[in-house]
């Protein structure tokens, strides 16, 4: 049986259930490479608690469908009266990285996992020439989740004070320039991850071959090196590579950009001080708050619930988006489809469009920037599920009572952008981490 | 106050059985991971079983197909049924409760003799 997601195969990914202190191990082509939980095992579970292993999911008893891997085993479970077995079920979502798999729950004798990524979308475009895992557990299985800084198009320019050069990099995939072809970016080579610009020629000096990798807490490391055994003149006989180190910086603060820190013979060393080289647990909520000594903020945007039916309207050209965020209630252009965005057309207000749900809402705060998030909404033709991204800024003088209004500001591939404007995305720091 | 409390350990002959109970008081229950331990005279402690807060249940290779771990969150306890005992599950048998939020909670431990 051929392999569901071939460009999944190369790995083996992590998973955790954090309340109970377990680490699953996935392959979901072959087996994971763990001899306690036997030879065959394409889920390992791993309890930190009693230090014990079982596999719950055997990769030859394997079963897939476009959106579903279901992979049985021979353990029974204690479903009494029945024949029951352990079994894990993995459902796939078209997202716009290769993603990780999120542990869901588990019962007697299913564990669930979901999985956004690239690899189950129904049309190609968001697919990279090359891409690797982008997070990492801790030691206290915390997450680390670089998947927010990918470039779907473009690069980022790094810090260097070399006027004859510019070296761009993405974040655990190569630069896509046919999406977004800036004119220094045109040049480089296809696959590369690190491109380096000398006046009208791109070099490639460096591709994602292995995963993101945690050296200390707060300290994640990506490295690329070049494929191609053809060397490059002003390299003096070395082949290139790039080391890229992500450090969560001690406290709060704004964004910095990738410094260069070292560079010799083609080796380039990167320094990047980024909050989401921290534990998500630090930067992100599923409420409408972020606040404790774990987040060292005070946010609460639940303010901006609109109750009574009414909504925020945000006009987008051919579309009005009907907003209500940081609640459940229903829109009512949205009449059950538990739309936290409602998309309607203007030229037909027949045709409406969940482009995020209220239960699928995430709350993050990184590097100065306030945004929420609803996905999970209705299909486009790639088979993404629509989302939106609302990018909130601090203004204490906003109007509608200190509430102000979304902004729409664009579409990318079914991803709908707003700014807002409101007293409530003034961050109230501790200082404390 | 954060308690476990187990009970219904006893002496019974080689291939009887018997129910334990832990009963647990100041936690929400159902949040919890419950484990079950055990400990022979002049050995270490050693896992037996565990019941997550979702339901998914583990076993030692020691007990499996003859042990049961459950629980009733309406009492707040959980239960280990033992069948087919053997002369080497005589121990103390001790429940634990964990979470992310409370460091792990011990109980008292019950004594288990399997002899004839």
């Known amino acids: 049986q051929a392999a569901p997601f071939p460009e999944l195969c190369s790995y083996t990914w992590e998973a955790v259930d954090t309340k109970n202190n377990v680490l699953y191990k996935i392959n979901i082509c072959g087996s994971v490479d763990i001899v306690q939980c036997g030879p065959s095992s394409a889920v390992c579970m791993h309890d930190l608690k009693t230090r014990t292993y079982h596999s719950v999911g055997d990769s030859v008893l394997r079963s897939a469908t476009r959106s579903l891997l279901e992979f049985n085993t021979t353990v029974s479970c204690d479903q009494q009266g029945t024949n029951h077995r352990v079994q894990s079920s993995i459902a796939f979502l078209c997202g716009k990285t290769l993603g990780t798999p999120e542990f869901v729950t588990a019962t007697e004798c299913v564990h669930y996992f979901e999985w956004r990524t690239t690899a189950a979308c129904k049309k190609d475009i968001f697919k990279a020439n090359k891409e690797v895992p982008c997070y990492v557990f801790d030691e206290e299985l915390r997450k680390h989740d670089l998947n927010p800084l990918i470039k779907l198009s473009g690069a980022y320019l790094v810090d260097d004070s070399d006027p004859d050069t510019s070296l761009f990099i993405n974040v655990c995939r190569d630069i896509d320039t046919l999406r977004d072809p800036g004119s220094q970016l045109r040049a480089c080579p296809p696959g590369t991850a690190a491109c380096l610009v000398r006046g009208h020629q791109a070099f490639d000096v460096g591709q994602p071959r292995d995963g993101l990798k945690v050296v200390r807490k707060d300290r994640l490391v990506l490295s690329y090196v070049r494929e191609e055994a053809g060397k490059l003149d002003f390299c003096d006989g070395h082949s290139p590579a790039v080391t890229i180190t992500f450090v969560c910086p001690s406290e709060r603060r704004e964004g910095t950009i990738p410094k260069l820190t070292a560079k010799s013979n083609c080796r380039y060393e990167i320094e990047w001080i980024t909050e989401y080289a921290c534990h998500r647990d630090y930067l992100e909520s599923k409420t409408c708050s972020l606040s404790g000594e774990q987040q060292d903020v005070s946010i609460d945007l639940t303010p901006l619930a609109q109750s009574g039916g009414s909504s925020y309207i945000s006009d987008g050209k051919e579309y009005l988006f009907y907003l209500n965020v940081c609640g459940e209630t229903e829109i009512q252009f949205c009449n059950k489809k538990q739309a936290a965005v409602c998309q309607v057309k203007k030229s037909d207000t027949s045709q409406v469009k969940a482009a995020g749900r209220y239960h699928n809402q995430t709350l993050r705060y990184s590097d100065g920037d306030l945004t929420l998030i609803y996905f999970g909404g209705d299909e486009c033709s790639s088979g993404f599920q629509r989302m939106s991204v609302i990018n909130f800024r601090c203004n204490k003088t906003a109007g509608n009572d200190g509430k102000g209004t979304p902004v729409f500001t664009g579409e990318v591939d079914c991803t709908y952008f707003f700014t807002w404007d409101t007293e409530y995305a003034c961050v109230h720091h501790h200082h404390h981490h | 106050q954060v308690q476990l409390q187990e009970s219904g350990g006893g002496l019974v002959q080689p291939g009887g059985s018997l129910r334990l109970s832990c009963a647990a008081s100041g936690i929400i229950f159902s949040d919890n991971r419950m484990d079950w331990y055990r400990q022979a005279p002049g050995k270490q402690r050693e896992w037996v079983a565990t019941l997550a807060s979702y339901g998914w249940k583990t076993y030692a290779d020691s007990v499996k197909g003859r042990f049961t771990i459950s629980r009733d969150n309406t009492k707040n306890t959980v239960y280990l049924r033992m069948n087919s005992l053997k002369p080497e599950d005589t121990a103390v048998y001790y429940c634990?409760?964990?979470?992310?939020?409370?460091?792990?909670?011990w109980g008292q431990g019950t004594q288990v003799t399997v002899s004839s």
């Open positions: 634990k409760a964990s979470s992310p939020v409370l460091n792990d909670i």
